[in-house]
Interface confidence: low
């Protein structure tokens, strides 16, 4: 499977909410022994490999923001914590998963990465990621609502394994 980023750039006014989205592409094994972990973190440009650096989002690490599918659902250790920081991660049955950030500030600007880890218990792991940029603007040049810029088809498809 691969991860696609429908939008590569989000430009939002300060105070607005935004939902950053990634999408799982290709065959997804729904077997009993397969677990998916999906999470989000910040990174920085100018690296050899995009998304190799993992920074917190509003002080929350990728551990705090993870989503988990398969197996029994353990205690949710991060949902309340995330909401206290104006964050919410979500996933649907169509392969889409997202992080919503509320009440944006200029400090939220930067590169965001989604990461999917497919774990076949007692066997193998497969990791893929996607990247997108968030620009939070203030002043007269800021848009009144978030403006999103689609990824080129090449960007969407050319996602490397993490």
């Amino acid at each position: 499977f691969k991860v696609a980023t429908p939008y590569s750039l989000y430009v939002c006014p300060e105070g607005q909410n935004v939902t950053l989205t990634c999408r799982l592409l290709g065959p997804v094994d729904k077997g009993h022994d397969v677990t998916f972990y999906k999470t989000w973190y910040r990174s920085s440009r100018g690296e050899v490999q995009t998304c190799s650096e993992r920074r917190p989002i509003r002080n929350l690490t990728f551990q705090d923001l993870h989503l988990h599918h398969g197996g029994h659902q353990a205690a949710n250790t991060s949902h309340d914590l995330a909401q206290r920081h104006g964050l919410e991660s979500a996933s649907d049955h169509h392969g889409n998963f997202s992080i919503t950030m509320r009440n944006l500030t200029l400090l939220d600007s930067g590169l965001y990465c989604c990461l999917v880890v497919e774990i076949r218990h007692h066997h193998s792991e497969h990791r893929v990621h996607g990247a997108m940029e968030l620009q939070v603007q203030t002043g007269k040049d800021a848009p009144s609502n978030c403006v999103v810029y689609p990824s080129s088809s090449q960007d969407s498809e050319n996602i490397t394994a993490a």
Epitope: T35, Y37, T39, R54, T61, F62, Q63, H66, H68, G71, H72, Q73, A74, A75, N76, T77, H79, D80, L81, V117, I119, R120, H121, H122, H123, E125, R127
Partner: antibody, heavy 120, light 107 residues
């Protein structure tokens, strides 16, 4: 069946460092948080910090920040906890513990414990 | 940090007794609470996760309840192998914190 096997007991001088290992077998190592929990003689349990090997970054309790380093070697399925500037009150049994499902912090598998004695 | 307070710190009971241990969090932790049993010289054992879910392999005489700040571990009919120390633990926020423990002794 998952097993966590820790290194043997240590006796250390105040001011020195100790590094305890925790080797996992019988399951996927990389994607489950490994925490270190200590227990001083006759006392309760104290979480020191944890690491998810797949990412390599650790989280530490503020109390131990700057004195503890938790690392993991995916190639050998081994986690390590190094505690520096040891003092007598660091005498304790140190346990590694694995989260039961991924990145949560409830612990269903534990090592046998490593007794670290700090004495001059 | 979230403080976890258990009561009582120790109790004496007989085989067959119903035993209740309480745990209070210094702030709401939803249902992000776990219970462990520890015997002398041994590592803790997970009994209950997510406040009320019984860990696989744990006898059904153990049960957990509560949400928010107040939680209870109940042993419906105490067995000889249940004499041990019990700890609650929150995993709502870091740092992870444990209660001080409740020692269940033979009367």
């Amino acid at each position: 069946q998952v097993q966590l096997v820790q290194s043997g007991a240590e006796v250390k001088k105040p001011g020195s460092s100790v590094k305890v290992s925790c080797k996992a077998s019988g399951g996927t190592f990389s994607s489950y948080a490994i925490s270190w929990v200590r227990q001083a003689p006759g006392q309760g349990l104290e979480w020191m910090g944890g690491i998810i090997p797949i990412f390599g970054t650790a989280n530490y309790a503020q109390k131990f920040q700057g004195r503890v380093t938790i690392t993991a070697d995916e190639s050998t399925s081994t986690a390590y906890m190094e505690l520096s500037s040891l003092r007598s009150e660091d005498t304790a049994v140190y346990y590694c513990a694995r989260s039961s499902y991924g990145w949560s912090y409830e612990f269903d598998y534990w090592g046998q414990g490593t007794l670290v004695t700090v004495s001059s | 940090d979230i403080q976890m307070t258990q009561s009582p710190s120790s109790l004496s009971a007989s085989v067959g007794d119903r035993v209740t241990i309480t745990c209070r969090a210094s702030q709401s932790i939803a249902t992000n609470l776990n219970w462990y049993q520890q015997k002398p010289g041994k590592a803790p054992k997970l009994l209950i996760y997510a406040a009320s879910s019984l860990q696989s392999g744990v006898p059904s005489r153990f049960s957990g309840s509560g949400s928010g700040t107040d939680f209870t571990l109940t042993i419906s009919s105490l067995q000889p192998e249940d004499f041990a120390t019990y700890y609650c633990q929150q995993n709502d926020d870091r740092p992870i914190t444990f209660g001080q423990g409740t020692k269940v002794e033979i009367k």
